[in-house]
Interface confidence: low
Amino acid sequence: IAPSRPWALMEQYEVVLPWRLPGPRVRRALPSHLGLHPERVSYVLGATGHNFTLHLRKNRDLLGSGYTETYTAANGSEVTEQPRGQDHCFYQGHVEGYPDSAASLSTCAGLRGFFQVGSDLHLIEPLDEGGEGGRHAVYQAEHLLQTAGTCGVSDDSLGSLLGPRTAAVFRPRPGDSLPSRETRYVELYVVVDNAEFQMLGSEAAVRHRVLEVVNHVDKLYQKLNFRVVLVGLEIWNSQDRFHVSPDPSVTLENLLTWQARQRTRRHLHDNVQLITGVDFTGTTVGFARVSAMCSHSSGAVNQDHSKNPVGVACTMAHEMGHNLGMDHDENVQGCRCQERFEAGRCIMAGSIGSSFPRMFSDCSQAYLESFLERPQSVCLANAPDLSHLVGGPVCGNLFVERGEQCDCGPPEDCRNRCCNSTTCQLAEGAQCAHGTCCQECKVKPAGELCRPKKDMCDLEEFCDGRHPECPEDAFQENGTPCSGGYCYNGACPTLAQQCQAFWGPGGQAAEESCFSYDILPGCKASRYRADMCGVLQCKGGQQPLGRAICIVDVCHALTTEDGTAYEPVPEGTRCGPEKVCWKGRCQDLHVYRSSNCSAQCHNHGVCNHKQECHCHAGWAPPHCAKLLTEVHAASGSLP
């Protein structure tokens, strides 16, 4: 974390000679330049008076299959490549005999990374060019000569975004279990500035360090049932694309403005992280937008402050935590970090201190779960399917892929007795292994609530007694009154809400007179219109990054860069009593309904947004006329 250059060295370390255990099909005789790294590998390290056996597995989910690398060619033009069939040497795993251990290492040129045993975080790196069997230093983070690094996100900026900080919110979960929800995925785009490139010296060195960093971040987030997948890397090997200032808040603003301009031609990602070689002012090593994940402001800046890449990985995990709605631990009354006090703090501590953190506190987890309840977090739900992953289906990667019935992670991590973790098939006698309607390896009985009603435009869902998954999310019938509007496909769209979505909390709908005209390209008011279903007109708030605006009097409309298209009032927005915008015109609510749908539901259900019967607990679709138990008995079906 020390800003001093060259990088600080270790104060105290132990020299070890790792020994690779012979394993099946380990291609030791092949020349190393072929880059054939085995799927699994194990090493024995003698350190701190113990022999640690590390069992490692290649992180197959490190790169998305659409992964790109962007850099500047010798002729000055920007080049984007999609490296094909990349073999890599980044591994994750555990330490034999230590139940809650973790390891994240690269084996590209010797062993480099970390392994955690209990509260002890051991860092390892080569001392010479002797490869994996050569001399390595094993040390603890507190023995890295460095000064404390802090996060630039201030308490003021957090307060309004995160709501009240009461200890009551943070009820620790029993045991050390993962949150019982679907895995979430962050599709990450990393930008490396010119100062970092100069410091590392080549594109290859930058690529190696970034993959190492993302591998570590992914390992840290796995404990929260998250995966971090790198979808793009941009290396500014010639010059910076925007000014990287020693003031991290300026740099973050510049990053987000630049990103907004680039979004249409670069990767569609969930989050962007800058790694910089610039020394930020004071002790700050990172800065992020709070609760911005999945929005245009989803990003952070990180100073590469330590010799060991675990340092910037911890900073990135921390700043990404802010993007995911987390506050600093010390700001939360009653926040518990399970770490031994002398071993250091948790990841969301405001300053890192002398040792690298390795876990998230209870309150960070509570903030995260609360963020995931917001509609905005939907971008994290899309699991990369087979085609996103380099290397095809892999049993143990937490993705249920072709030929698998379940996937609960590697055998050492799997705590799901319903799933045979070595074959990714259901255990004997199990009906299911995953899903909201799966309990103790059996499908829950029909009628059990599996998805509660989120808001007034939502409907609750119940298990059907046959499937381990909760039925598809359904919403109130379009046109059902909701706060200030009418439900439309699960939302309650109003002009005020749309303006806030674009212009922030201060955004409001403009005066009614603003909606009286359509706007032609070039900000010219055109013909009179009789309703409020044309261009979205707002006032107040902050101009969205990377968007051009068209101002006529007090009316603000968002336009594309070339001024040819305007942000329209969305379908379903209330435009008067019993009226909604539909196909660009203000029309009667009955445009939503072709018939009296609810009458077909036999008083045991209501109509949903698809004009289908949504049955009460225990009743069978499509018309809620029969009990699910009768239907199942008649078909004699098991799940």
């Epitope: 998305g64 299959s65 659409g66 249409t264 569609l268 999945c294 939907v378 971008c379 990369p384 399917d385 085609s387 996103h388 594309t560 040819t564 298209a565 379908e571």
Partner: nanobody, 121 residues
């Protein structure tokens, strides 16, 4: 609006090759899928090949192994490499783009004017 301009069609002998290109311009946001369809005289239009945002591809059985669809994400261009052409491949080939204005918003679909491919025996 989105404009799609196809090129590369023409007359070719059976067994020959052609490469179709389709360049998209205009108000492009989040492209979900780019595809090629074709319509032979007196027949229904059929999907020939499609490529998803995540590079996943999908082909009409009849052209599998002979045709390859690819895209350049940074030029918003889709290509159809057609090898071992057969007379039955004769048709007007249409480019199709499906996009969203924002993640999870409704899908919009756009079509090109079509390019004629004629395979003589």
């Amino acid at each position: 609006e989105v404009q799609l301009v196809e090129s590369g069609g023409g007359l070719v002998q059976a067994g020959g090759s052609l490469r179709l290109s389709c360049a998209a311009s205009g108000n492009i946001f989040r492209i979900e899928t780019m595809a090629w369809h074709r319509q032979a005289p007196g027949k229904q239009r059929e999907l020939v090949a499609a490529i998803r945002r995540d590079e996943m591809t999908n082909y009409l059985d009849f052209v599998k192994g002979r045709f390859t669809i690819s895209r350049d994400n940074f030029k918003n261009t889709v290509y159809l490499q057609m090898n071992s052409l057969k007379p039955e491949d004769t048709a007007v080939y249409y480019c199709n783009l499906i996009q969203r204005r924002a993640p999870y918003s409704r899908l919009e679909t756009y079509w090109g004017q079509g390019t004629q491919v004629t395979v003589s025996s």
